[in-house]
């Protein structure tokens, strides 16, 4: 369970792939589309508000039923819209929703080598946001394999300004 309804902290950042392609968001036909693309040099990167929440780790060894904490994150590129996992379609979508956010909007944050991050679905452990055919998709990762596969690695470039939604 998430340890509180409020995030412990928030930050504004641009999101790019391991290969430095930008994650961009475009309003099309009253819904948002997510793209993975090479940005022209003069084009500004899209910002995402990351809200970080603590979640108790279910215990397998300690007697008190919890075993430390995980860090969960929600990603919002524009007011009232959040990235959500669609596990049936293996897709990542932007949906307008009100708080409390659904579980599909929460991702376990994994720090990776070279200061990259990965986002694991709260609703489907072992499934990560990844890049497939220039789009974001949900990708199943075998834990026995190296989780460093490049298509689930992302770079966060923090934008140090007031951490509120951009409109």
């Amino acid at each position: 369970s998430i340890t509180g309804i409020s995030p412990i902290t928030e930050s504004l950042a641009s999101l790019s792939t391991y290969n430095d392609q930008s994650i961009t968001f475009a309003l099309e036909d009253e819904s948002y589309e997510i793209y993975v693309e090479d940005l022209k040099k003069d084009k500004k990167k899209d910002k995402v508000l990351l809200s970080y929440y603590e979640s108790q780790h279910p215990s397998s060894e300690s007697g008190d039923g919890v075993d430390g904490k995980m860090l969960m994150v929600t990603l919002s590129p524009t007011k009232d819209f959040w990235l959500q996992a669609n596990n049936k379609e293996h897709s990542v979508e932007l949906h307008k929703c009100e708080k409390p956010l659904p579980d599909q909007a929460f991702f376990v944050l994994h720090n990776r080598s070279f200061n990259c991050v990965s986002f694991e679905c709260k609703t489907d452990p072992g499934v990560f946001i990844g890049v497939k055919d220039n789009h974001l998709a949900l990708i199943k990762v075998d834990y026995s394999e190296n989780l460093g596969s490049e298509n689930i690695l992302f770079k966060l470039s923090e934008i140090l300004e007031h951490h509120h939604h951009h409109h």
Partner: antibody
């Protein structure tokens, strides 16, 4: 109760080797990244090495690269630091530390062992 | 690498005082900063993480604030057991780096 207990420190000559161990209990060891942090006498703290869980990615401070090797045995709930080609400047108390968050280093270290002293001297 | 500079390096204070320790980062980040307390011959103890979140079991007289490059640890109503050395640590990016420490001594 979370416990981290280091062992294996001692007096060693320059160029010598030591293997430090850190026995962990009270949490699911395999789920958490673990680190070694050292503190030279009268000095501050320095992250020496870190071992992530998934994918097993490792970090080494530039000052120890090629000489120290971090490893873990999840079946024994134990973290190791193999120290080779030791130098006088490696003299320090070595602490093992548990990552606050299971999959992220953002929270720092929430539990530390009591430390084991490594003295490199002829 | 992000360098962390703590000030002052030492401070003399009395029981009941308010003590403020600052930590400056060589490059900015949002809030992934931790504060530790260390007593002679003991391991460091986590007090604050994510710049302002109080670690479980730590008294509420300890508080943290800041973002970007400037962070602060404040101890209100200093107690005898608070005389120790305090370290900040940036947990934003590898290598995770510590400040040089601030020793809080009895006046």
């Amino acid at each position: 109760e979370v416990q981290l207990v280091e062992s294996g420190g001692g007096l060693v000559q320059p160029g010598g080797s030591l293997r430090l161990s850190c026995a962990a209990s009270g949490f699911t060891f395999r789920s958490f990244a673990m680190s070694w942090v050292r503190q030279a006498p009268g000095k501050g703290l320095e992250l020496v090495s870190d071992l992530r869980t998934s994918g097993g990615s490792t970090y080494y401070a530039d000052s120890v690269k090629g000489r120290l090797t971090i490893s873990r045995d999840n079946s024994k709930n134990t973290l190791y630091l193999q120290m080779n080609s030791l130098r006088a400047e490696d003299t320090a108390v070595y602490y093992c530390a548990k990552s606050h968050y299971s999959t992220s280093w953002f929270g720092g270290f929430d539990y530390w062992g009591q430390g084991t002293l490594v003295t490199v001297s002829s | 690498d992000i360098q962390m500079t703590q000030s002052p390096s030492s401070v003399s204070a009395s029981v009941g005082d308010r003590v403020t320790i600052t930590c400056r980062a060589s490059q900015g980040f949002s809030s992934w900063l931790a504060w530790y307390q260390q007593k002679p011959g003991k391991a460091p103890k986590l007090l604050i993480y994510a710049a302002s979140s109080l670690q479980s079991g730590v008294p509420s007289r300890f508080s943290g604030s800041g973002s970007g490059t400037d962070f602060t640890l404040t101890i209100t109503n200093l107690q005898p057991e608070d005389f120790a050395t305090y370290y900040c640590q940036q947990a934003n990016s590898f290598p995770l780096t510590f400040g040089g420490g601030t020793k809080v001594e009895i006046k």
